[in-house]
């Protein structure tokens, strides 16, 4: 069966030894009692470690109480609190306990004192040259203003490079957009609609203020 010293019944660092009847505690200096639970130490002995503040105890069984500074605990402020065990750094950040504070080192794609900012969302994203940030699918992209491209809209782009004019139409870059000069028999902003021989076309009704063939803004 379990021995009388299992679980160490001796408090305050006392060492337990088995006796024929039960157990006996050998107490460290300043403690006494069956389980070394009574302290003979007072604040004059300076029992509080790590900058703990000692206050005289209110009852006879407790000659003093240590008020521990942040980061320490235990009856004598002898134990350092592992504040990093609470995993305060978000998104897999590395936690460093500096003593006076914590420091989070963030994984790639995250920032902030606790790594709480996702740089892959628009909150921390700057799109250059008038581009706007668009979120989606846990990532972001920049929707660039005309004439610019690339991840951050920093690169100059040719709006005609993607060959936007259908059916052999010729593309011209224009300050307000691109203009398609359509080949005979085609019409529309992108020359996408054939002109029928009877003069009618397959062109849907133009939106208000936009004539067929006008550059799209």
């Amino acid at each position: 069966g379990p021995g009388p010293c299992d679980g160490n019944p001796c408090a305050n660092g006392g060492s337990c030894s088995e006796t024929p009847r039960s157990f006996e505690c050998t107490c460290p200096r300043g403690f006494y009692g069956l389980r070394c639970e009574v302290s003979g130490v007072t604040c004059a002995d300076g029992p509080c470690f790590n900058g703990g503040l000692c206050v005289g105890g209110a009852d006879p069984d407790s000659a003093y109480i240590c008020h521990c500074p942040p980061g320490f605990q235990g009856s004598n402020c002898e134990k350092r609190v592992d504040r990093c065990s609470l995993q305060p750094c978000r998104n897999g950040g590395l936690c460093l306990d500096l003593g006076h504070a914590l420091r989070c080192r963030c994984r790639a794609g995250f920032a902030g004192p606790r790594c709480e900012h996702d740089l892959d969302d628009c909150a921390g994203r700057a799109c250059a040259n008038g581009g706007t940030c668009v979120e989606g699918g846990g990532a972001h992209r920049c929707s660039c203003a005309l004439g610019f491209g690339g991840r951050d809209c920093r690169e100059r782009a040719d709006p005609c490079a993607a060959r936007p004019c259908a059916h052999g139409g010729r593309c011209y870059a224009h300050f307000s957009g691109l203009v398609c000069a359509c080949a005979p028999g085609y019409m529309g902003a992108r020359c996408e609609f054939p002109v029928h021989p009877d003069g009618a076309s397959a062109l849907p009704a133009a939106p208000p203020g936009l004539r067929p063939g006008d550059p799209q803004r």
């Epitope: 942040p70 305060p88 003593g99 420091r103 080192r105 790639a108 920032a111 004192p113």
Partner: antibody, heavy 128, light 112 residues
Framework: QEQLVESGGGLVQPGASLTLTCKAS????????MCWVRQAPGKGPEWIAC???????AYSASWAKGRFTVSKTSSTAVTLQVTGLTAADTATYFC??????????????????????WGPGTLVTVSS | DIVMTQTPASVEAAVGGTVTIKCQAS??????LAWYQQKPGQPPKLLMH???VLTSGVPSRFSGSGYGTEFTLTISDLECADAATYYC??????????????FGGGTEVVVK
Amino acid sequence: QEQLVESGGGLVQPGASLTLTCKASGFDFTSNAMCWVRQAPGKGPEWIACIYNDDGSAYSASWAKGRFTVSKTSSTAVTLQVTGLTAADTATYFCARSPYYTYGGAPSAYASGYFNLWGPGTLVTVSS
Amino acid sequence: DIVMTQTPASVEAAVGGTVTIKCQASENIYNSLAWYQQKPGQPPKLLMHDASVLTSGVPSRFSGSGYGTEFTLTISDLECADAATYYCQSDYYSTGGSYGFAFGGGTEVVVK
């Protein structure tokens, strides 16, 4: 507006001691560390020491221990005391703020690891 | 303590051009890197922190990248006002329990 101003520099003799003062205005001193960084002529910045305003914890570069002491003297001022000055200590001494951030329910303040406000600096020249 | 190594020591580029400055840390610092701009007679000014997060008011012509030990500051569409010395900086925490800060040696940017 947020501002740091250093004072106390000047021409001093080798072996002398000096106390530099940094006064802050326009922001809450708490949840910040106030630091000292020096820059010798034509060289890069060199961190000396900081004091965390919330609990007075001070930390300094290993080379600065012993001769450089940082203290908080009021709710808006910190000092850097330098002893045993030599010609190698000739530099512009800057006061800089390193912000700390606190969150409700968090176990501690969080250090930022950078300096987001600097004073104009005070020049210390050590020469006989 | 950590050592921050910056290259090149000096770089020259024309107005409208692009310059790239590299910073290498002697150990893994994750994203814990800041960049500063310093002009003669002035204190350093924080440009960006967390390797790539721009400080408020800094134009988006400045961009930062990198992770671990290798970091880059890129200045595009160079302007005359960008002529300055640029420094990288990180913080360190050693096993002995000491916390502190280290700067790179600086890169002078000359704009033609």
